[in-house]
Interface confidence: low
């Protein structure tokens, strides 16, 4: 592989690494969305919530003169409850909505697939760099692109999940905004998907320059 190509691959791998860090951050944190009630009756406190793929946290926040609840960064009594994805017999204390649970299970499962693809891609990259097997960069690039797509699907499932929660008559929350974990997931998708495509492009053998050349005649990769 030529020096310029190697440099391009390294830059792409750095972008992919940033994508991996962002994807990991998004998966393990629970600030995908912040939900707040619109209190029609004057209360001294209100209950806002933020949630991720694995749990929902509610926080009792002091109310101001307006009817808005928050921001969630205000100090308050916090109570977190895990979505019990893997023990269907039990329902979560806070989350008793079956449709919502299905959404969070889907998003979490797809995120796990994404992490699986990231691991496979990283193994391919490590083997490629260690043993100079440049051809392994091609499957690695595909794995990263697939990981990015899985993150995108997770993001969309979470968007639907938030919409269902807000529209449901069985939650107190009416207003919402997407938070930093969601932004991390979106950025991870862009970096992994585009990085994967770029890596695929840079790791492919050089196309023949002349009509009489075949791919086999092209200069070797190393």
């Amino acid at each position: 592989m030529s020096q310029t190509k190697m440099l391009k691959v390294r830059v792409t791998l750095f972008c992919i690494l940033a994508g991996i860090v962002l994807a990991m951050t998004a998966v393990v944190t629970d600030h995908w969305a912040v939900l707040s009630p619109h209190m029609e009756h004057h209360n001294t406190t209100c209950e806002a919530a933020h949630f991720g793929l694995w749990r929902i946290c509610t926080k009792r926040i002091p109310m101001d003169d307006s009817k808005t609840c928050g921001p969630i960064t205000l100090p308050g009594e916090k109570n977190c409850s895990y979505f019990r994805h893997f023990n269907p017999g039990e329902s979560s204390e806070i989350f008793e909505f079956t449709t919502q649970k299905e959404y969070s299970i889907s998003a979490a499962a797809i995120a796990i697939f994404s992490l699986g693809f990231i691991i496979l891609g990283s193994l391919c990259v490590l083997l490629s760099l260690g043993k100079k097997r440049d051809y392994l960069l091609r499957p690695a690039s595909m794995f990263y692109a697939f990981a990015g797509l899985c993150i995108l699907v997770s993001v969309e499932v979470m968007r639907q999940s938030v919409k269902r929660m807000i529209d449901s008559e069985d939650t107190v929350w009416i207003e919402y905004y997407y938070s930093w974990s969601f932004a991390c997931a979106c950025a991870a998708f862009i970096l992994l998907f585009l990085g994967g495509l770029a890596l695929l492009l840079f790791s492919l053998p050089r196309m023949p320059r002349n009509p009489w050349e075949s791919c086999m005649d092209a200069e070797p990769e190393h």
Partner: antibody, heavy 125, light 110 residues
Framework: EVQLLESGGGLAQPGGSLRLSCAAS????????MSWVRQAPGKGLEWVSS????????YYAASVKGRFTVSRDNSKKTLYLQMNSLRAEDTAVYYC??????????????????WGQGTTVTVSA | QSVLTQPPSASGTPGQRVAISCSGS????????LYWYQQIPGTTPKLLIY???QRPSGVPDRFSASKSGTSASLAISGLRSGDEADYYC???????????FGTGTKVTVL
């Protein structure tokens, strides 16, 4: 199926008392605000009272404050309206309505999505 | 005396569009969600619109609502004979700490 069934209406004398009940079924009663609304003959709807899911917060219309008491027994899935010092103007059909979802810090809204069939209260000498 | 004012009556021929207004103040419509109820003669009221413009499942999309400042309106398009009813707007009122209904509008299909 979500259902509300009122009872306890009837004839009462001015200054007398009546206790209305509203039996709920088909939903998690303790998670919802409940309300009483009345309609005098040939007149429009008038909100009477509301109570939060836990029963801890109650609201009353100015016309009934101090005379009517709203309460609920979540174990029996029943809403009550104790009416004392009844007046002729309290004559109406009384409806109970299922309100918005309640969390520990407040209720979502008081739009009534399910109504009972109503019970008639007549206050006359 | 209701704090939400509605016209006493509205009418239209089948297929026509009818609009009902509801006027209030900052303490009710201006600062809270608005609801619309339909009461067909001899029946119990039914929630038609919640949270300003949302329709509960089962309510046809011929019914639509909007809110602007301290007033609101309910529109019925493609009027049918089955739409003959009394329509009430309602909202929470902060100053009264209570729920207030509009005066009601009787819709007649000619």
């Amino acid at each position: 199926e979500v259902q509300l069934l009122e009872s306890g209406g009837g004839l009462a004398q001015p200054g007398g008392s009546l206790r209305l009940s509203c039996a709920a079924s088909g939903f998690t009663f303790s998670s919802y605000a409940m309300s009483w609304v009345r309609q005098a003959p040939g007149k429009g709807l008038e909100w009477v009272s509301s109570v939060s899911g836990s029963g801890g917060t109650t609201y009353y219309a100015a016309s009934v404050k101090g005379r009517f008491t709203v309460s609920r027994d979540n174990s029996k899935k029943t809403l009550y309206l104790q009416m004392n010092s009844l007046r002729a103007e309290d004559t109406a059909v009384y409806y109970c309505g299922k309100g918005g979802y309640c969390s520990s810090s407040g209720c979502r809204h008081y739009g009534m999505d399910v109504w009972g069939q109503g019970t008639t209260v007549t206050v006359s000498a | 005396q209701s704090v939400l004012t509605q016209p006493p009556s509205a009418s239209g021929t089948p297929g026509q569009r009818v609009a009902i207004s509801c006027s209030g103040s900052n303490s009710n419509i201006g600062n809270n969600y608005l609801y619309w109820y339909q009461q067909i003669p001899g029946t119990t009221p039914k929630l038609l619109i919640y949270r300003n413009n949302q329709r509960p499942s089962g309510v046809p999309d011929r019914f639509s609502a909007s809110k602007s400042g301290t007033s609101a309106s309910l529109a019925i398009s493609g009027l049918r004979s089955g739409d003959e009813a009394d329509y009430y707007c309602a909202a929470w009122d902060d100053s009264l700490s209570g729920y207030v209904f509009g005066t009601g509008t009787k819709v007649t299909v000619l």
